[in-house]
Amino acid sequence: MSGLGRSRRGGRSRVDQEERFPQGLWTGVAMRSCPEEQYWDPLLGTCMSCKTICNHQSQRTCAAFCRSLSCRKEQGKFYDHLLRDCISCASICGQHPKQCAYFCENKLRSPVNLPPELRRQRSGEVENNSDNSGRYQGLEHRGSEASPALPGLKLSADQVALVYST
């Protein structure tokens, strides 16, 4: 019955406005930090679910969460919270995180399906490609971890956890 959330108009989403009014819209109502899957709704004055606004045309407040949500729906991909990007498992099989285990293990059983560079790796060829030197190592963070996107940058576990900051 409800068309809300399905037939939206264009223009800035209402929830984007907190970027310009981070303190909220009511006098005396302080903006709180919200769980990663929620955003601060300045009109209601409470943390609200990002899931229900992911289909809004121009929401940015929940951008990282919404990207991860849509990424998880794609087979053979996972959302890298550190890089804030949707990563194809096919491109990192062999040095893959656990999110890609199912995909990569199936692929490795049938080498005909592997991309050429991985077929060469399996047959003993070593590709000396500078693009692979920073190959993604997975998000098995324990304490301090080097960021694959920013070589040399050390991130604490707490910093890694701050993946949905807006």
């Epitope: 409800s2 809300l4 800035r12 819209l25 209601l44 679910s49 899931k51 606004i53």
Partner: antibody, heavy 120, light 111 residues
Amino acid sequence: EVQLQQSGPELVKPGASVRMSCKASGYTFTNYVMHWVKQKPGQGLEWIGYINPSNDDTKYTEKFKGKATLTSDKSSSTAYMELSSLTSEDSAVYYCARGTHGDYYALDYWGQGTSVTVSS
Amino acid sequence: DIVLTQSPASLAVSLGQSVTISCRASESVEYYGTSLMQWYQQKPGQAPKLLIYGASNVESGVPARFSGSGSGTDFSLNIHPVEEDDIAMYFCQQSRKVPWTFGGGTKLEIK
């Protein structure tokens, strides 16, 4: 299909309290706030407040602070409203309604209402 | 609190005619280009039903004869053509500021 099923009519004595329920189905209960609205016989609609089931945040209109208490139970997807120190002024139909958020803010689904009659 | 004043309080129209119900807010309900004004229909013995949200967006499943317009503080609900099924109370409601508030209602009757 989204549905809000409210508890049955109540006949209560002045000074007593009453607790009514609103069971939600057909959507993720914690993703939307639940509003409560009062309607006296033959009169208009009066917003009482809302509860956010994900964190139990509540907001009330000034008039209902101390009169209404909103709670929710995530495990049963049920919102509750308790009205205390009842008088004849509290005789009304009380509706729960789901509130949308994000681009637009509206009450898109309503319960059928719970009738409360305060009489000695 | 934002006060919403609806007019007229009641009106009687002939089937097939047009009808316009007005709602005036005590202050603007605009928020970054969107009017946070809704319209609801309530038939006797039933719960209210959302007709229009954001001043002019027709809710899914609502007949196209219902339309909403306005911005800032002045809004209107238009029904054209009026059908027998439209006999009801109509309420405007703002969600720009908590507490959300409703207009006093307009009773639509058929001549």
